[in-house]
Amino acid sequence: VPLSRTVRCTCISISNQPVNPRSLEKLEIIPASQFCPRVEIIATMKKKGEKRCLNPESKAIKNLLKAVSKERSKRSP
């Protein structure tokens, strides 16, 4: 019988709320792994440095990811 692995994801709660890309200090995308079977997106806000988990399935968050990657591709030569 295989040992049951304890699931230890970082995100206890998630937000579906839209986030203004300008208010972001950092956006971490943690891929699924042996410890956590789901993708986790952690946003660190500029104001107060609050950290929030974002719902990868939310339309608003998908749009945010598109906007952020667009911004990054503009910056890179």
């Epitope: 709660s13 998630i14 950290k51």
Partner: antibody, heavy 118, light 111 residues
Framework: QLVESGGGVVQPGRSLRLSCAAS????????MHWVRQAPGKGLEWVAV????????YYADSVKGRFTISRDNSMKTLYLQMNSLRTEDTAVYYC?????????????WGQGTMVTVSS | QSVLTQPPSASGTPGQRVTISCSGS????????VNWYQQLPGAAPKLLIY???QRPSGVPDRFSGSKSGTSASLAISGLQSEDEADYYC????????????FGGGTKVTVL
């Protein structure tokens, strides 16, 4: 709003299941906690479960005896308590997670009393 | 024995300023934010301060929180009779199994 139920008087070694009915917020996106308070004592955190039920953390004092679970379709949180001991006697509160990192407790229910006595 | 250390009691006369300390370690207060809860007699705890120094809506600005290193404090300025309650600090602890840790509570008495 959070409303706990299922408390009562139980003998040592027996089991009890507490429920917490949630309303007024999007239950399926918030982690949920159980916290207890023995008569005349301070607050003791018991367990937390993630929004999807996939991640659970327990206090050492209840690990292996208590199980936290949730039913998002019913907007209900549960605490299955097995092998109860006299020291588990307390008011049990459910609480909504703050929503940010790290986890924390936001809104609390009014509590349900569990008495473990022979 | 609570993981976070608070004085068991504090007191003051109406209008005075009362400060409650909360001492922890690098795995809790040192690396995570602190929340404070007020528990009035016979009632459930209520969130008073979150993320070290933020007040939820409806909490008077007489209550303020701060954090430095592995310690935090709650200040009540202009103490009022309705502030007589138990106050608890709490933080997430990054220890191996991860959990929320509380202080033992401080009973505030208005003289």
């Amino acid at each position: 709003q959070l409303v706990e139920s299922g408390g009562g008087v139980v003998q040592p070694g027996r089991s009890l299941r507490l429920s917490c009915a949630a309303s007024g917020f999007t239950f399926s996106t918030y982690g949920m906690h159980w916290v207890r308070q023995a008569p005349g004592k301070g607050l003791e955190w018991v367990a937390v479960i993630s929004y999807d039920g996939g991640t659970k953390y327990y206090a050492d004092s209840v690990k292996g005896r208590f199980t936290i679970s949730r039913d998002n379709s019913m907007k209900t949180l549960y605490l299955q308590m097995n092998s109860l001991r006299t020291e588990d006697t307390a008011v049990y509160y459910c609480a909504k997670d703050l929503g940010d990192l790290p986890p924390g407790l936001d809104y609390w229910g009014q509590g349900t009393m569990v008495t473990v006595s022979s | 024995q609570s993981v976070l250390t608070q004085p068991p009691s504090a007191s003051g006369t109406p209008g005075q300023r009362v400060t409650i300390s909360c001492s922890g370690s690098s795995s809790n207060i040192g690396s995570n934010t602190v929340n404070w809860y007020q528990q009035l007699p016979g009632a459930a705890p209520k969130l008073l301060i979150y993320t070290n120094n933020q007040r939820p809506s409806g909490v008077p600005d007489r209550f303020s929180g701060s954090k430095s290193g592995t310690s935090a404090s709650l200040a009540i300025s202009g103490l009022q009779s309705e502030d007589e309650a138990d106050y608890y600090c709490a933080a997430w602890d990054d220890s191996l199994n991860g959990n929320v840790v509380f202080g033992g509570g401080t009973k505030v008495t208005v003289l």
